[in-house]
């Protein structure tokens, strides 16, 4: 079941996945200039059995001036580069390795992909806040969001973080000084698709990745 | 010219329907996808649903979910959007949105449709 919503906007926040639950959607989307192929898959799909995730599909784009032609999809360093470096982009990640059963990581940049990514989740989703360069993080509780389903609606978990306007970046989970003993989550709430293992484990995972990969839904 | 022209907006009751239609010309709907967005005044423009073509992804805004449901014509060029159980708040102009990609929903999601429509203005009253 897809999230009806895109996870809260925090204040001089964003946000990013550490793996993709089963079922992910990402848009094929092109930069200026390019187009998605007319036969070209609309998204790319996580999909998976008990052993494996991997992303279904590939995105490709050409140029809006040559309908016909397919551009390869092995990225380029140049249009690497043109990513938004605020998102991270790790390259090296194999496509087809999951960290987590069920689950998916980043997919490898395309040629001539649109500089920010568009995310489908589904339910049971975590995603982590980290506030921008030059907000500093003040912890009430958990600095991340669960996408759940209540009563048949899917809501996402209000994460517990403010960003104040001072000189110094915040890092990622495992990394920070909280500023406060974190509480526990504000509301006490009965999921039905989310369990206390993805919460472990998600969390375990986001405090050793090394790599960090850093994406934002379309703002 | 691309033109697309929502129509069906009027003043209806709390509890009751309405049917908008979103007619699309200059462009083959069966390579876009369609969405609503809707601005009520002094707010700010708002996802409402939105359908590719391929029917692989239909979003809806959690406000809506239940009560609306976005579907469309592609040979007859045309999209739809039922409202049922309709609430004051749902009071608003609303617009048809399309695009040659993929889904694009949430908060600030209007950015990313390449043609809008002028919009029509749905009142409920309590």
């Known amino acids: 079941e897809l999230c009806d919503d895109d996870p809260p906007e925090i204040p001089h926040a964003t946000f990013k996945a550490m793996a993709y639950k089963e079922g992910t959607m990402l848009n094929c989307e092109c930069k200026r200039g390019f187009r998605r192929i007319k036969s070209g898959s609309l998204y790319m799909l996580c999909t998976g059995n008990s052993s494996h995730s991997s992303w279904d599909n590939q995105c490709q784009c050409t140029s809006s001036a040559t309908r016909n032609t397919t551009k390869q999809v092995t990225p380029q360093p140049e249009e690497q580069k043109e990513r938004k470096t605020t998102e991270m982009q790790s390259p090296m990640q194999p496509v087809d390795q999951a960290s987590l059963p069920g689950h998916c990581r980043e997919p490898p940049p395309w040629e001539n992909e649109a500089t920010e990514r568009i995310y489908h989740f589904v339910v049971g989703q975590m995603v982590y806040y980290q506030c921008v360069q030059g907000y500093r993080a003040l912890h009430r509780g958990p600095a991340e969001s669960v996408c759940k389903m209540t009563h048949g609606k899917t809501r996402w978990t209000q994460p517990q973080l403010i960003c104040t306007g001072e000189m110094e970046t915040s890092q990622f989970p495992g990394e920070e000084k909280p500023q406060a003993s974190p509480e526990g989550r504000p509301e006490s709430e009965t999921s039905c698709l989310v369990t206390t293992t993805d919460f472990q484990i998600q969390t375990e995972m986001a405090a050793t990745m090394e790599t960090s990969i850093f994406t934002t839904e379309y703002q | 010219e691309v033109q697309l022209v929502e129509s069906g907006g009027g003043l209806v009751q709390a509890g009751g329907s309405l049917g908008l239609s979103c007619a699309a010309s200059?462009?083959?709907?069966?390579?876009?996808?369609m969405a609503w967005f809707r601005q009520a005044p002094g707010k700010e423009r708002e996802f409402v649903a939105a359908?590719?073509?391929?029917?692989?992804?239909?979003r809806y805004a959690s406000s809506v979910k239940g009560r609306f449901t976005i579907s469309r014509d592609n040979a007859g060029n045309t999209g739809f959007l039922q409202m049922n159980s309709l609430r004051p708040e749902d009071t608003a102009v609303y617009y048809c949105a399309a695009r040659e990609g993929g889904v694009v929903a949430g908060v600030r999601s209007g950015a990313p449709y390449d043609y809008w429509g002028q919009g029509t203005q749905v009142t409920v009253s309590p």
């Open positions: 200059g462009i083959t709907f069966n390579d876009h996808t």
């Open positions: 359908r590719d073509w391929s029917d692989i992804i239909t």
